[in-house]
């Protein structure tokens, strides 16, 4: 007459997080008499899961009617699955006596746990960085299980090649984490671009997770400066500009000095916007050649976000009728001011 | 689905006797097969399970002089040493108690251990 | 071992009455629940009633049920019908295979 066998009939089992895991186990014999347990994992530290016998678990829930007669079915199921709840299950038939003796076991179900990753979280350097420069970016994501997964990178749509990533843990673990370094030159067209982190993993059905920084956060384009002198408004007096272009961003403070000395300081505000995503602003100066004996030189003089100052001159000679002065080149930026200079 | 037990009968003191009980409409193979007697006029007593070869016991009093096989459409059950305490109608069931209770029953078979 | 002691040993009542028949173990059943309610009528075998002290026997009326936990069981027949005239046995289950006695039964006979 054949003994009592513990069936299991799943190797493994995967379910999504959230979900429920049905577990199969049926004995083909009700002898002996004794409770079914279930358990995870196997040796001295197992995990009592459920005991037909005794206990509360409110997580557990019989298939079929336990109480029934002539049940064999011990199929049980595990509510709202966690990835801590990954291992392999073993049915184990006990003989009723003091204590219950384990009679024997099923072969075992692995339950695995399908967990989305976290959103990817981007982030970029802690200071701006100039055009031509080399920046780092990272991306996170987080508690994901299975440990295969798929992470790319993107600029404007373009992929990147230049980055580093890891999966944590090497071994065996409930979750997983994933954390990915890229390099990306900056242009002076970056200001619009953006930096795409994209994960792609079972449990999205192929549809990945996207997390994204503006390069606008991480870039700063520094100004040219261009100082020109304009025909005359009236007599005696001559016009010079200051043309700040293609800077981002906007935070800029402007300068004149004539002959060394500060004559005005001021704050872009009215710029204008590049299709680039920079800025113009141009300061005017109206100077009364009148009231100057000597050549006077002028200087514009522009603070970009904190940085060093750069500036452009121009040479205005007194001498001369102010028809024939030429004018000198400098850099770019816009914005409007007059002053005249007496 | 049910059982039937045979081979009771008058038996003198000290003599053995084999009882049956055949299962008609189920297979015993995944049951225990349980036996309990009954003196006249007196309650139910439970004597032991036949489960499979490793998986037979007995009540510490009918333990050495009751044993037990079974086959997967019949059990018996081997009594020796009889004495006159135990004339009682012999009953079998299917079921080892607790989760698998004793049903359905044999209608009863008469043993009487007389000189 | 185990014991069972069941009360009253015996009891008349009416068609109708509700009857309420005990069973004390002298420890606790296996699993606090091996605890079965058996009814024998004169010259027949025994029928169950009740297992795992509330669970209800395929076919058996919803008038008997059965409650209890532990060493402390009760079988409960709320409406008695002319057929329920019969004696009532608990069969308690203790910690080892063997271990199953019978309580020394209960008599409901007609008033």
């Known amino acids: 007459e054949e003994e009592l066998q513990v069936i299991q009939p799943d190797k493994s089992v995967s379910v999504a997080a959230g979900e429920s895991a049905i577990l199969h186990c049926t004995v083909t014999s009700l002898i002996p008499v004794g409770p079914i347990q279930w358990f995870r994992g196997a040796g001295p530290a197992r995990e009592l899961i459920y005991n037909q016998k005794e206990g509360h678990f409110p997580r557990v829930t019989t298939v079929s009617e336990s109480t029934k007669r002539e049940n064999m079915d011990f199929s049980i199921s595990i509510s709202n699955i966690t990835p801590a709840d990954a291992g392999t299950y073993y049915c184990v038939k006990f003989r009723k006596g003091s204590p219950d003796t384990e009679f024997k076991s099923g072969a075992g179900t692995e339950l695995s746990v399908r967990a989305k990753p976290s959103a990817p979280v981007v982030s970029g350097p802690a200071a701006r960085a100039t055009p031509q420069h080399t920046v780092s970016f990272t991306c996170e994501s987080h508690g994901f299980s299975p440990r295969d997964i798929t992470l790319k990178w993107f600029k404007n749509g373009n992929e990147l090649s230049d980055f580093q990533t890891n999966v944590d843990p090497v071994g065996e673990s409930v979750s997983y984490s994933i954390h990915s370094t890229a390099k990306v030159v900056l242009t002076r067209e970056d200001v619009h671009s953006q930096v795409i982190c994209e994960v792609a993993h079972v449990t999205l059905q192929g549809d990945p997770l996207r997390g994204t920084a503006n390069l606008s956060e991480t870039i700063r384009v520094p100004p040219t400066l261009e100082v020109t002198q304009q025909p005359v408004r009236a007599e005696n007096q001559v016009n010079v500009t200051c043309q700040v272009r293609k800077f981002y961003p906007q935070r800029l403070q402007l300068t004149w000095l004539e002959n060394g000395n500060v004559s005005r300081t001021e704050t872009a505000s009215t710029v204008t916007e590049n299709k680039d995503g920079t800025y113009n602003w141009m300061s005017w100066l109206l100077v009364n050649v009148s009231a100057h004996r000597d050549d006077v030189k002028l200087t514009c003089q522009v603070e970009h976000d904190g940085q060093p100052a750069v500036s452009k001159s121009h040479d205005l000679k007194v001498s001369a009728h102010p028809k024939e002065q030429g004018s000198n080149t400098a850099a770019e930026n816009t914005g409007s001011n007059e002053r005249n200079i007496y | 689905r049910q059982l039937v037990e045979s081979g009771g009968g008058l038996v003198q003191p000290g003599g053995s006797l084999r009882l049956s009980c055949t299962a008609s409409?189920?297979?015993?193979?995944?049951?225990?097969i349980s036996w309990v007697r009954q003196a006249p006029g007196k309650g139910l007593e439970y004597i032991g399970t036949?489960?499979?070869?490793?998986i037979t016991y007995f009540a510490s009093w009918a333990k050495g002089r009751f044993t037990g096989s079974k086959t997967s459409s019949t059990a018996y059950m081997e009594l020796s040493s009889l004495r006159s305490e135990d004339t009682a109608v012999y009953f079998c069931?299917?079921?080892?108690?607790?989760?698998?209770?004793?049903?359905?029953w044999g209608q009863g078979t008469l043993v009487t251990v007389s000189s | 071992a185990i014991q069972m002691t069941q009360s009253p040993s015996s009891l008349s009542a009416s068609v109708g009455d509700r009857v309420t028949i005990t069973c004390q173990a002298s420890q606790s059943v296996y699993g606090n629940n091996d605890l079965a309610w058996y009814q024998q009528k004169p010259g027949k075998a025994p029928k169950l009633l009740i297992y795992l002290a509330s669970t209800l026997a395929t076919g058996v009326p919803s008038r008997f049920s059965g409650s209890g936990s532990g060493t402390d069981f009760t079988l409960t027949i709320s409406s008695l019908q002319p057929e329920d005239f019969a004696t009532y046995y608990c069969l308690g289950g203790g910690d080892d295979e063997a271990d199953n006695v019978f309580g020394g039964g209960t008599k409901v006979e007609i008033k």
């Open positions: 409409g189920f297979s015993l193979s995944s049951h225990g």
């Open positions: 036949i489960g499979t070869g490793v």
């Open positions: 069931a299917r079921g080892s108690a607790w989760n698998d209770p004793f049903d359905p």
